[in-house]
């Protein structure tokens, strides 16, 4: 039975040209995290495999930095980066857990971070 929960940074906003850290955390399970995939709608941003290291998709190579930890740093933000991001935790023996983050990239300097929330 899958007992874990994914905690994410939730709904977040950031300024155009700035950077943001996408972060998820898996809790309430003893399952081993073997890999974390980061996706945006229909494309892969990055994969962090516990053994094989990082894969960064070529579309994002210039402005995605691995980490901190299993997270992802997205740099040089544009308004086109607005949208849903997913962290997919591959675990053993539980299977996969998915977390969702909504990022809004703002033109102005009124960007504020949203509250953290949990997805079961």
């Amino acid at each position: 039975m899958m007992t874990g929960t994914i905690e994410t940074t939730g709904n977040i906003s950031a300024e155009k040209g700035g950077s943001i850290i996408l972060q998820c955390h898996l809790s309430s399970t003893t399952a081993q995290v073997t890999q974390v995939n980061w996706e945006q709608q229909d494309q892969l941003l990055a994969i962090c495999n516990a053994d094989l290291g990082w894969h960064i998709s070529p579309s994002f190579k210039d402005r995605v930095a691995p980490g901190p930890g299993l997270g992802l740093t997205l740099q040089s933000l544009t308004v086109n980066d607005t949208g849903e991001y997913f962290c997919i935790y591959h675990t053993y023996p539980d299977g996969t857990y998915t977390g969702r983050i909504f990022l809004e990239v703002l033109e102005s300097s009124v960007a504020e971070h949203g509250a953290r929330f949990q997805i079961p």
Epitope: T34, Q35, N37, E39, D42, Q43, L44, I47, N49, A50, D51, L52, G53, W54, H55, I56, S57, P58, S59, K61, P66, H90
Partner: antibody
Framework: QVQLVQSGAEVVKPGASVKVSCKTS????????MHWVRQAPGQRLEWMGG????????RNNQKFKGRVTITVDTSASTAYMELSSLRSEDTAVYYC????????????WGQGTLVTVSS | DIQMTQSPSSLSTSVGDRVTITCKAS??????VVWYQQKPGKAPKLLIY???YRYTGVPSRFSGSGSGTDFTFTISSLQPEDFATYYC?????????FGQGTKVEIK
């Protein structure tokens, strides 16, 4: 230029083990993950596992149920794949391949090593 | 494990023809797909990755597309040196898996 040079063909008996080497040159060995892929006669390619030479992190295909051991000697820029408890269906060409820096696509391959399991 | 199924398994065609190969994943693999070319007795060669980027030195007649579970590999105008077997492969999750291959033969 990047080169991956594998050890020569082997004929081994069922139940025995084989160890294939892959000597690399032309790049910084610890910066790229190394993989082993095999191909039985007329069959599709099959990923056996990979190793991150920087930290020894190792991920194997569970199909091989612990029969595969992948190691590296960083001082010699060489990767090794040992397959134990060999059976006839392990007869195949075994390839080493490296994946790119922060990229999982396997961009350079060894020439292949034919392993024949026969009594 | 994720199964990768290519179609067709083989095709007979002529120089100058357009060739399209499809690859279907048994579950979502996002854009984590690669295409290789293999000639008899030789190691595979990387052609396309992620799944629409041509590897260094690969001619522009080779292209790829797709996302999720459905992927396409195209040779816009087949050249004599293109007769070979082509494989798709996913690296979305381990174990990485390959399609069964598509053999492109001379008609």
């Amino acid at each position: 230029q990047v080169q991956l040079v594998q050890s020569g063909a082997e004929v081994v008996k069922p139940g025995a083990s084989v160890k294939v080497s892959c000597k690399t040159s032309g790049y910084t060995f610890t910066e790229n993950t190394m993989h082993w892929v095999r191909q039985a006669p007329g069959q599709r390619l099959e990923w056996m596992g990979g190793i991150n030479p920087q930290n020894g992190g190792n991920r194997n295909n569970q199909k091989f149920k612990g029969r595969v051991t992948i190691t590296v000697d960083t001082s010699a820029s060489t990767a090794y794949m040992e397959l134990s408890s060999l059976r006839s269906e392990d007869t195949a060409v075994y390839y080493c391949a490296r994946s790119g820096l922060r990229d999982y696509a396997m961009d350079y391959w060894g020439q292949g090593t034919l392993v024949t399991v026969s009594s | 494990d994720i199964q990768m199924t290519q179609s067709p398994s083989s095709l007979s065609t002529s120089v100058g023809d357009r060739v399209t190969i499809t690859c279907k994943a048994s579950q979502h693999v996002s854009t984590a797909v690669v295409w290789y070319q293999q000639k008899p007795g030789k190691a595979p060669k990387l052609l396309i990755y992620s799944p629409s980027y041509r590897y260094t030195g690969v001619p522009s007649r080779f292209s790829g597309s797709g996302s999720g579970t459905d992927f396409t590999f195209t040779i816009s105008s087949l050249q004599p040196e293109d007769f070979a077997t082509y494989y798709c492969q996913q690296h979305y999750s381990t174990p990485w898996t390959f399609g069964q291959g598509t053999k492109v033969e001379i008609k």
